[in-house]
Interface confidence: medium
């Protein structure tokens, strides 16, 4: 709405930078052939680039990425009973970000 | 995979708490009847509940919410020329979170 402008602070752009996000650990990351198990923890924190750029032709993209292996619990259900094992999932953290030109060709108008 | 367990740190659950997220300010929030304008800034930071809970029956939900009006620029394009106006968008920040019981019945195993 256009009302109550006096109490509103000017909106600040969410700059292009790394922020902490929650990454859901899907079972497919651990075992694509078997769905008869659970993963713990179900989600972890990762660092990801997010935010907006000053120009429509550029996007916030990671310029430096780090792979981080973490150990999770793979809880296999065998005859309704659990077997606790370890599995390694490789997470991707973004270390640095930049507003980069979008390479895709723009539609002709 | 189940390999290279030694170098992998144990995965820590992304606890249920507020985190900074990027909220895209859609034009529909400002004017549903007209699409012939731009909004600046296109995105802002908000506080949102995210993360996982220790239990299957609960979800991370906000327990305290605050509405925050912010002022944005509405840039109307009239005969290929920009007209700058102000508009207020009300953002929703989550102030506190809790793992709350999901009402839906659990499947029988």
């Amino acid at each position: 709405s256009l009302g109550s402008l006096t109490i509103a602070e000017p909106a600040m752009i969410a700059e292009c930078k790394t922020r902490t996000e929650v990454f859901e650990i899907s079972r497919r990351l651990i075992d694509r052939t078997n769905a008869n198990f659970l993963v713990w923890p179900p989600c972890v924190e990762v660092q990801r680039c997010s935010g907006c750029c000053n120009n429509r032709n550029v996007q916030c993209r990671p310029t430096q990425v780090q792979l981080r292996p973490v150990q999770v619990r793979k809880i296999e259900i065998v005859r309704k009973k659990p077997i606790f094992k370890k599995a390694t999932v490789t997470l991707e953290d973004h270390l640095a970000c930049k507003c980069e030109t979008v390479a895709a060709a723009r539609p002709v108008t | 995979s189940l390999g290279s367990l030694t170098i992998a740190e144990p995965a820590m659950i992304a606890e249920c708490k507020t985190r900074t997220e990027v909220f895209e300010i859609s034009r529909r929030l400002i004017d549903r009847t007209n699409a012939n304008f731009l909004v600046w800034p296109p995105c802002v930071e908000v506080q949102r509940c995210s993360g996982c809970c220790n239990n299957r029956n609960v979800q991370c939900r906000p327990t305290q919410v605050q509405l925050r009006p912010v002022q944005v620029r509405k840039i109307e394009i009239v005969r290929k020329k920009p007209i700058f106006k102000k508009a207020t968008v009300t953002l929703e920040d989550h102030l506190a979170c809790k793992c709350e019981t999901v009402a839906a019945a659990r499947p029988v195993t």
Epitope: L38, W40, R73, I75, V78, K80, K81, P82, I83, F84, K85, K86 | L2, L5, P10, N54, N55, R56, N57, V58, C99, R106, T109
Partner: antibody
């Protein structure tokens, strides 16, 4: 205060029955799996039984299978162990303990223990 | 059934490092927890998931687990650390405990 308070131990004859209780307070009992662990005099810890947060999954050590029954009443924040056909070798201090997750894991909170003596 | 084997006793001088081992078939594939028990008291969790320390447990307690052996290490051992220590792993629907190790601080 987060705690587990046990009751129900005592002296019982071989073949007899006993019901142990474990009252939880200071935390959301229904969100945690629970176990019973016992310790015979001068011996080590022996896991007895496990129950998931909602009571849908129950496991028992081979030594007590068919004789002991674990249960819980989440409305009363209480864990139970019904012990039937008791034998002399069941004599031990019985501990209830909390798992931090619905599926199990470590035991991060223990009761004070209650002594069960099976003797004629 | 799955078994965890611990040495019955370990001795250490104050200020020295004590290591208590726990062995089992492919133990590194499971998460190991360690409990401390002092005479007449309930057990206390000191290490969980191989190497994590619960809040309130001193930094001198650490753990590792690979291959067939998990190890609890107490660096700068103090007199108050004298106790029985048990390793544990939740394996095939069974929460298995080791036989326990009596740590004596000389």
């Amino acid at each position: 205060e987060v705690q587990l308070l046990q009751s129900g131990g005592g002296l019982v004859k071989p073949g007899g029955s006993l019901r142990l209780s474990c009252a939880a307070s200071g935390f959301t009992f229904s969100s945690y799996a629970m176990s019973w662990v016992r310790q015979a005099p001068g011996k080590g810890l022996e896991w007895v039984s496990y129950i998931s947060d909602d009571g849908s999954l129950k496991y028992y050590a081979d030594s007590v299978k068919g004789r002991f029954t674990i249960s819980r009443d989440n409305s009363k924040n209480t864990l139970y162990l019904q012990m039937n056909s008791l034998r002399a070798e069941d004599t031990a201090v019985y501990y209830c303990a909390r798992h931090p997750y619905w599926y199990g894991g470590q035991l991060d909170l223990w009761g004070q223990g209650t002594l069960v003596t099976v003797s004629s | 059934s799955y078994e965890l084997t611990q040495p019955p006793s370990v001795s250490v001088s104050p200020g020295q490092t004590a290591s208590i081992t726990c062995s089992g078939d492919s133990l590194g594939s499971y998460f190991v927890h360690w409990y401390q028990q002092k005479p007449g008291q309930s057990p206390v969790l000191v290490i969980y998931d191989d190497s994590n320390r619960p809040s309130g447990i001193p930094e001198r307690f650490s753990g590792s687990n690979s291959g067939n052996t998990a190890t609890l290490t107490i660096s700068g051992t103090q007199a108050m650390d004298e106790a029985d220590y048990y390793c544990s792993a939740f394996t095939h629907n069974s929460n298995v405990f080791g036989g326990g190790t009596k740590l004596t601080v000389l």
